[in-house]
Interface confidence: medium
């Protein structure tokens, strides 16, 4: 067990042209807050997959009001760290998503309004117990500077927080079975703590949080007897003639799910669907609050008004469920007409129209170029009874009205994965690379290989280059 810690250093306009407008104004004062989502491994998972390692929400930052005519500065940040506790081993490699949210404090009916300003993502290698690692990521015209680390919570130690230590019983040395716990010279390696609820009779562990079953038992907590292969029915009664181990009741018999959770059988055991406010294998853990970051996929968490709903997730378009964990298949409604191909981009629906059709839902029938104009500097080309537009760079679609897919040019270097986003694009870098476009290799010592420093700048200072 341990904690992943994230320190946001600055959020503001990135270098170069096209500085963003300030997100706040005298008419609409606002403040920022951040959300971090962690996933184990160097996963190629889509942005909406669950934050399996955990998530956290920062406090709100100071209220900021833009000075008229002033460029957008680095915006005032919330105090403190974002902390994501992890219960099991630290995986060593992880993927992250950091979202910057704006809370508008104007006179909106129904309270403050929230909007996502920027989202950055990346994949990193990180040993627990190591020093802070610094990083810089860009999302469109915004730039986010931050540091992160993973640390073990006692009694766990080691680069994966898998070794457990406890104070020595004798001043001189550990017992023969308990190894010294470097670097804690006065502590000794201690037994593992298995997954909560793991049957002490039928389960054991060789990794923290694990529950391995002794022979004849199965299920996540090793509480379900297994029938032998000679049993005809997996639920059949115990019999000396069939040679079956007593299989006992079905995994959902007696409903093992607490706090109103509903049980469904799985091929090997059971699964509990928990009501809001509860989680865990058997819905036994309660008291989830917004501080636990329970809302996925950019959902916004609001504290519930009554004890039975400790939080409420306001889901962005395209997601639903009590934790915004379910993706809505809006294309199933077949919104694109005339055989258009429907694309659900998460934040918006898009229709890719067949030749001869155009419009947001492919509702316009286009015969030729007569009276037709291609937007944004595009030129009309006739052919085959239909027209098409040859669009200027950066635009696409039937009438050049759509911005081109920012990922089409493969902007992420070194095998980085590109995610299109309404604020621009996000590169999720392959292991060993960092930077807004994954252009910099990361050396094992954590320094990045940067271009030679211009005169007057120190080499090895990533903030000055990215």
């Amino acid at each position: 067990a341990g904690v992943f810690e994230l320190q946001i250093h600055s959020f503001g306009p990135g270098p170069g042209p096209g500085a963003p407008r300030s997100p706040c104004s005298a008419r609409l004062p606002c403040r920022l807050f951040f959300r971090v989502c962690l996933k184990p491994g160097l996963s190629e998972e889509a942005a909406e997959s669950p934050c399996a390692l955990g998530a956290a929400l920062s406090a709100r930052g100071p209220v900021y009001t833009e000075q008229p005519g002033a460029p957008a500065p680095d915006l005032p940040l919330p105090d403190g760290l974002l902390q994501v506790p992890f219960r099991d081993a630290w995986p060593g490699t992880f993927s992250f998503i950091i979202e910057t949210w704006r809370e508008e404090l104007g006179d909106q009916i129904g309270g403050p309004a929230w909007s996502l300003l920027a989202r950055v993502a990346g994949r990193r290698r990180l040993a627990a117990g190591g020093p802070w690692a610094r990083d810089i990521q860009r999302a469109g015209a915004w730039e986010l500077r931050f540091s992160y680390r993973a640390r073990c919570e006692p009694p766990a130690v080691g680069t994966a927080c898998t070794r457990l230590c406890r104070p020595r019983s004798a001043p001189s040395r550990c017992g023969p079975g308990l190894r010294p716990c470097a670097p804690l010279e006065d502590e000794c390696e201690a037994p593992l703590v298995c997954r909560a609820g793991c049957s002490p009779e039928h389960g054991f562990c060789e990794q923290p949080g694990e529950c391995r079953c002794l022979e004849g038992w199965t299920g996540p907590l090793c509480t379900v007897p297994v029938s032998t292969s000679s049993c005809l029915s997996p639920r059949g009664p115990s019999s000396a003639t069939t040679g079956c181990l007593v299989p006992g009741p079905g995994p959902c018999d007696g409903n093992p799910c607490a706090n109103g959770g509903s049980c469904s059988e799985t091929p090997r055991s059971f699964e509990c669907t928990c009501p809001r406010g509860f989680y865990g294998l058997r819905c036994e853990v309660s008291g989830v609050t917004c501080a636990d970051g329970p809302c996925f996929n950019g959902g916004l968490c609001v504290g519930g008004a009554d004890p039975d709903s400790a939080y409420i997730c306001h889901c962005p378009p395209g997601f639903q469920g009590s934790n915004c964990e379910k993706r809505v298949d809006r294309c199933s409604l077949q919104p694109c007409r005339n055989g258009g191909l429907c694309l659900d981009l998460g934040h918006a629906l898009r229709c890719r129209c067949r030749a001869g059709f155009a419009g947001p839902r492919c509702e316009h029938d286009l015969d030729d170029c007569a009276g037709r104009a291609c937007a944004n500097g595009g030129t009309c080309v006739e052919g085959g009874g239909a027209h098409r537009c040859s669009c200027a760079l950066g635009f696409g679609g039937r009438d050049c009205r759509e911005r081109a897919d920012p990922c089409a040019a493969r902007p992420c270097a070194h095998g980085g994965r590109c995610y299109a986003h309404f604020s621009g694009l996000v590169c999720a870098c392959a292991p060993g690379y960092m930077g807004a476009r994954c252009e910099f290799p990361v050396h094992p010592d954590g320094a990045s290989a940067l271009p030679a420093a211009p005169p007057g700048l120190r080499p090895g200072d990533p903030q000055r280059y990215l």
Epitope: P155, L164, R166, S169, C174, G175, P176, G177, L178, C188, A190, P191, L192, V193, C194, P200, G203, F204, C205, E206, R212, L214, E215
Partner: antibody, heavy 120, light 112 residues
């Protein structure tokens, strides 16, 4: 039915070597930590050494550290104890024993034992 | 090492009577992280290997008669045989498996 059968015991001179084997059957050998426990004639039980399920971690009593080596071959379902620099006080019945799970679990099955006698 | 001390060294009890064996460890075998006592009880009859009776200080091994029970926590533990049977004559050992592994010296149980 869990069965553990020790072999390799016998008479050996002080300073000599012996290798004990334990053939396991009736369970998934590769899932369990294993130990060697000995019992001198007319005396109590003394734990000697242990090894985790995949052989990656070994543990020894101070009295045998540096002289005995525990190992296992999961493909052969066999546990070994290599005993070097034997002393008279190593004379005992040596039991092969299965843990209920990993190292930090009680032993639940024992073999019948093999007698090692160290004498000149 | 953790030293395990059993008392008494030998015990004679009438058939059908209660037998109690005590075991004291030189330091606690309760692991605070999971609140388990890493202590087991074994029975050994002449010419046979030991047999597991109790683990986690109080959990009876499958197939062990319910007249055997274990209790205690930290450093003081007890094995109780509620109604002694003739087949219970044996040497009983307590065993800690938290810090390395050590056994008590054994308690010989006989019929009075």
């Amino acid at each position: 039915q869990v069965e553990l059968v020790e072999s390799g015991g016998g008479l050996v001179q002080p300073g000599g070597s012996l290798r004990l084997s334990c053939a396991a059957s009736g369970f998934t050998f590769s899932s369990y930590a294993m130990s060697w426990v000995r019992q001198a004639p007319g005396k109590g039980l003394e734990w000697v050494a242990a090894i985790n399920s995949n052989g990656g971690n070994t543990y020894y009593a101070d009295s045998v550290k540096g002289r005995f080596t525990i190992s296992r071959d999961n493909s052969k379902n066999t546990l070994y104890l290599q005993m070097n620099s034997l002393r008279a006080e190593d004379t005992a019945v040596y039991y092969c024993a299965r843990h209920r799970g990993g190292f930090y679990y009680a032993v639940d099955y024992w073999g019948q034992g093999t007698l090692v006698t160290v004498s000149s | 090492d953790i030293v395990m001390t059993q008392s008494p060294d030998s015990l004679a009890v009438s058939l059908g009577e209660r037998a109690t064996i005590n075991c004291k460890s030189s330091q606690s075998v309760l692991y605070s992280s999971n609140q388990k006592n890493y202590l087991a009880w074994y029975q050994q009859k002449p010419g046979q290997p030991p047999k597991l009776l109790i683990y986690w200080a109080s959990t009876r091994e499958s197939g062990v008669p319910d007249r055997f029970s274990g209790s205690g926590s930290g450093t003081d533990f007890t094995l109780t045989i509620s109604s002694l049977q003739a087949e219970d004559v044996a040497v009983y050992y307590c065993h800690q498996y938290l810090s390395s592994r050590t056994f008590g010296q054994g308690t010989r149980l006989e019929i009075k």
